[in-house]
Amino acid sequence: PRIVEHPSDVIVSKGEPTTLNCKAEGRPTPTIEWYKDGERVETDKDDPRSHRMLLPSGSLFFLRIVHGRRSKPDEGSYVCVARNYLGEAVSRNASLEVALLRDDFRQNPTDVVVAAGEPAILECQPPRGHPEPTIYWKKDKVRIDDKEERISIRGGKLMISNTRKSDAGMYTCVGTNMVGERDSDPAELT
């Protein structure tokens, strides 16, 4: 047999469905099994209650990605193996990684007092996450447009040059990735 469609790396959120593709050709038609980190993967063919289904095509379908604080049964490196009595073919490795976004910010912004006309800098480090979270800022619950020439956002820093009285307010840093969004504690610019 030979593998004609190899599985691809995937990053997926906990609780979401996903599929690792695999297609094989051969005569006689090969059977397909999946292995994760070297251990055979149980599917609905072994246990009807399984959250993993072996599709007729040979792909592995996850009804929902299961991922706990400690047990992470779906995360790992997968291969599909196609077999018939003439031999076997092994696919390329595909990693299944579970997206993550923690709640706690590595650095919350702190209150800043600045004189009008002076620059102001607010700093933030988003929560740990996978993929690595990006950030944006809100002022008084409204997203800040960083296209305004006085405002620049680089890394975790919000820099306002030549501050005005109208810049005063409550600033919140928002960390975001495919899992969702997390709001920092607000910081007051006075």
Epitope: K36, D37, E39, R40, V41, E42, D46, D47, V66, H67, G68, R69, R70, S71, K72, P73, D74, G76
Partner: antibody, heavy 118, light 105 residues
Framework: EVQLVQSGAEVKKPGASVKVSCKAS????????MHWVRQAPGQGLEWMGW????????NFPQKFQGRVTMTRDTSITTAYMDLSRLRSDDTAVYYC???????????WGQGTMVTVSS | DIVMTQSPSSLSASVGDRVTITCRAS??????LNWYQQKPGKAPKLLIY???SLQSGVPSRFSGSGSGTDFTLTISSLQPEDFATYYC???????FGGGTKVEIK
């Protein structure tokens, strides 16, 4: 069928050690943490620690540190719990339990009675 | 360590009664709380995980609620097979509550 099957009852003298086994079947052994929980006669459930079958890493509450050892053999999908320097108050039913991806003990062994008596 | 306090330690009830068991954590555990049922001579059985999610195969008369430090297990209409001991467990540090024995009145 997903199940955990434990070794049989043991009778031990004070100061001895006991090793209880837990054979897992019907699921990917290395994907789920294995825990040990004990229950003295007429008492509640007491968590003893966990082993990550993938890495072999372990964690125990302070009460059991230095006296309990948890190991696994992935080739036969079996976890082991070794308790040393046994005392009479270690008399209990010892359970292994699988921790699901929902952070709960969804599959339990049938229990192993360990009696410590002189 | 986070200490889990269950109350009451025992209660008497009749078939058809609504039964409520509470569990209090010594500090916030968000929704990391599970409930188990144990019958004499048997291993515990998972009923509720993540404070309010019903484990597959468990009758819908069992429900869980709460978050933070205060949690409740409710049996809406007690059945003869529900007479057992119930344990809460926090899944951060994994310790169990002391148990609640539900007996026939």
């Amino acid at each position: 069928e997903v199940q955990l099957v434990q070794s049989g009852a043991e009778v031990k003298k004070p100061g001895a050690s006991v090793k209880v086994s837990c054979k897992a079947s019907g699921y990917t052994f290395t994907g789920y943490y294995m825990h040990w929980v004990r229950q003295a006669p007429g008492q509640g459930l007491e968590w003893m620690g966990w082993i990550n079958p993938n890495s072999g890493a372990t964690n125990f509450p302070q009460k059991f540190q230095g006296r309990v050892t948890m190991t696994r053999d992935t080739s036969i999908t079996t976890a082991y719990m070794d308790l040393s320097r046994l005392r009479s108050d270690d008399t209990a039913v010892y359970y292994c339990a699988r921790e699901s991806g929902d952070d709960a003990f969804d599959i339990w062994g049938q229990g192993t009675m360990v009696t410590v008596s002189s | 360590d986070i200490v889990m306090t269950q109350s009451p330690s025992s209660l008497s009830a009749s078939v058809g009664d609504r039964v409520t068991i509470t569990c209090r954590a010594s500090q916030s555990i968000s929704s990391y709380l599970n409930w188990y049922q144990q019958k004499p001579g048997k291993a515990p059985k998972l009923l509720i995980y993540a404070a309010s999610s019903l484990q597959s195969g468990v009758p819908s008369r069992f429900s869980g609620s709460g978050s933070g430090t205060d949690f409740t297990l409710t049996i809406s209409s007690l059945q003869p097979e529900d007479f057992a001991t119930y344990y809460c467990q926090q899944s951060v540090g994994l310790f169990f509550g002391g148990g609640t024995k539900v007996e026939i009145k």
